[in-house]
């Protein structure tokens, strides 16, 4: 029961996390114009991994994609790569974990196989989460560096006559979405790894051994410690706890759909 709950919860948390990583990657507000000195601005700039946008006070918004690949900063390329790797690993992890779920039966898949798949997906979720957190953190560090550099050069002028205000950028909503999503994916991965330990058979298969006590004809057949089906025949050397009876928590549950704003 606890194992299934842990595995199911790990899956759902990871699913939410990966959806968040995808959302963060697609969002345009990775960096937003700093409004500290001017809270009411006529032109508001914000930038994402794929395009930069300008929202005018007239309500008009214009976005331009970064059509160059070689002209982009190496750090931005690195962040893109980390986020994409995170999404790919997370997506594969989700696919693997669906088949690993204890509440879903696929043919005669053994628990050892499900345990391995749960561990694999858990590791994938952990790496995916770390990639997202790393990507967002690298971008945040880049912003902090640029922020203080632009603060130092806030006003440049021709003999002090003409002022050119340099636009400063601060953390955008996507960074917070990315950090939270990465954290959720990481937590989900850890939960899957914990669930894997509970799924893994702790004892190898035992051959049925008959003990004949004098005067009695009772056969003791030690089975798996998780047996709940009683002393059934185990002639084919199957693990007893892999039997057909299913507990309440093993009823098939369908993951609910989540809306992301």
């Amino acid at each position: 029961m606890a194992v299934t709950a842990c595995q199911g919860l790990g899956f759902v948390v990871s699913l939410i996390g990966i959806a968040g990583i995808i959302a963060a990657t697609c969002m345009d507000q990775w960096s937003t114009q700093d409004l500290y000195n001017n809270p009411v601005t006529a032109v508001f700039n914000y930038q994402g991994l794929w395009r930069s946008c300008v929202r005018e006070s007239s309500g008009f918004t214009e976005c331009r994609g970064y059509f160059t690949l070689l002209g982009l900063p190496a750090m931005l390329q690195a962040v893109r790569a980390l986020m994409i790797v995170g999404i790919v690993l997370g997506a594969i992890g989700l696919l693997v974990s669906i088949f690993a779920l204890k509440c879903i039966r696929i043919g005669s898949m053994e628990d050892s196989a499900k345990a391995n798949m749960t561990l694999t997906s858990g590791i994938m979720f952990i790496v995916s989460g770390l990639c997202a957190i790393a990507g967002v953190s690298v971008f945040a560090n880049m912003l902090v560096t640029n922020f203080w550099m632009s603060t130092a050069n806030m006003y440049t002028g021709m003999g002090g006559m003409v002022q050119t205000v340099q636009t400063r950028y601060t953390f955008g909503a996507a960074l917070f979405v990315g950090w939270v999503a990465g954290g959720l994916t990481l937590i989900g991965g850890v939960m899957m790894c914990i669930a894997c330990r509970g799924l893994a058979p702790e004892e190898t298969n035992y051959k049925a051994v008959s003990y004949h006590a004098s005067g009695h004809s009772v056969a003791y057949k030690p089975g798996g410690f998780k047996a709940s089906t009683g002393f059934g025949s185990n002639t084919k050397n199957k693990k007893i706890y892999d039997g057909g009876a299913r507990t309440e928590d093993e009823v098939q549950s369908y993951p609910s759909k989540h809306d992301y704003v």
């Epitope: 700039n45 930069s52 005018e56 309500g59 050119t164």
Partner: antibody, heavy 118, light 113 residues
């Protein structure tokens, strides 16, 4: 076609109040901001305010804070300019204009002449 | 506030002549986010409301004759009328649309000989 029709000329005494209306037609009123511009007789244009017609939030020029109130009636696609405690220097033609890309103003009302005289 | 200084204050030209009006801003109107200059040119004929000619310093508004051309960047801008027509008799205003308040220039009055 797109039109901004303003209310007729007004004659007021100092200390009185005047309310100018600007009715928009031919477009979705809340999709564009509304600007107000003042032009004193024989003078240049003076930007007064910029109103977000969706939220109703105005952005004023410093000279037009206090006695000037900018409001909207979105159901009637109308913007209003209220001037309290009129002064002689408020004598001018007031224009409303639709804000578009580049924060520019493409369609203008015909203007409302306000004369403040004792 | 940003201050726009227009020159000359008035100009008398003959029909067909090429004329350039200038507008100098006290602060750069170039937005780094989209590399656009937030400056507008408007034309006001006597007894009429202003009419938008140019926005983003060089983008001509639809319906505006192509003899009107906007140029410049940063703090210095120009409006060029390649061949002045009688109907171009008006006052021309440049306006900052980059930062509140959206101040107008003092205007250049174009007169025909």
């Amino acid at each position: 076609q797109i039109q901004l029709v303003q209310s007729g000329p007004e004659l007021r005494k100092p200390g009185e109040t005047v309310k100018i209306s600007c009715k928009a037609s031919g477009y979705t009123f809340t999709a564009y901001t509304m600007g107000w511009v003042k032009q004193a007789p024989g003078k240049g244009l003076e930007w007064m305010a910029w109103i977000n017609t969706y939220s109703g939030v105005p952005t004023y020029a410093a000279d037009f804070k206090g006695r000037f109130a900018f409001s909207l009636e979105t159901s009637a696609s109308t913007a209003y300019l209220l001037i309290n405690n009129l002064k002689n220097e408020d004598t001018a033609t007031y224009f409303c204009a639709r804000g578009v890309r580049g924060n520019s103003m493409d369609y203008w009302g015909q203007g409302t002449s306000v004369t403040v005289s004792s | 506030d940003i201050v726009e200084t227009q020159s000359p204050s008035s100009l008398t030209v003959t029909v067909g002549e090429r004329v350039t009006l200038s507008c100098k801003s006290s602060q750069s109107l170039l937005n780094s986010g989209n590399q656009r200059n937030y400056l507008t040119w408007s034309q006001q004929k006597p007894g009429q409301p202003p009419k938008l000619l140019i926005y983003w310093a060089s983008t001509r508004e639809s319906g505006v004759p192509n003899r009107f051309t906007g140029g410049g960047s940063g703090t210095y801008f120009t409006l060029t009328i390649s061949s002045v027509q009688v109907e171009d008799l008006a006052v021309y205003y440049c306006q900052n649309t980059y930062s509140f308040p959206f101040t107008f220039g003092t205007g250049t009055k174009l007169e025909i000989k």
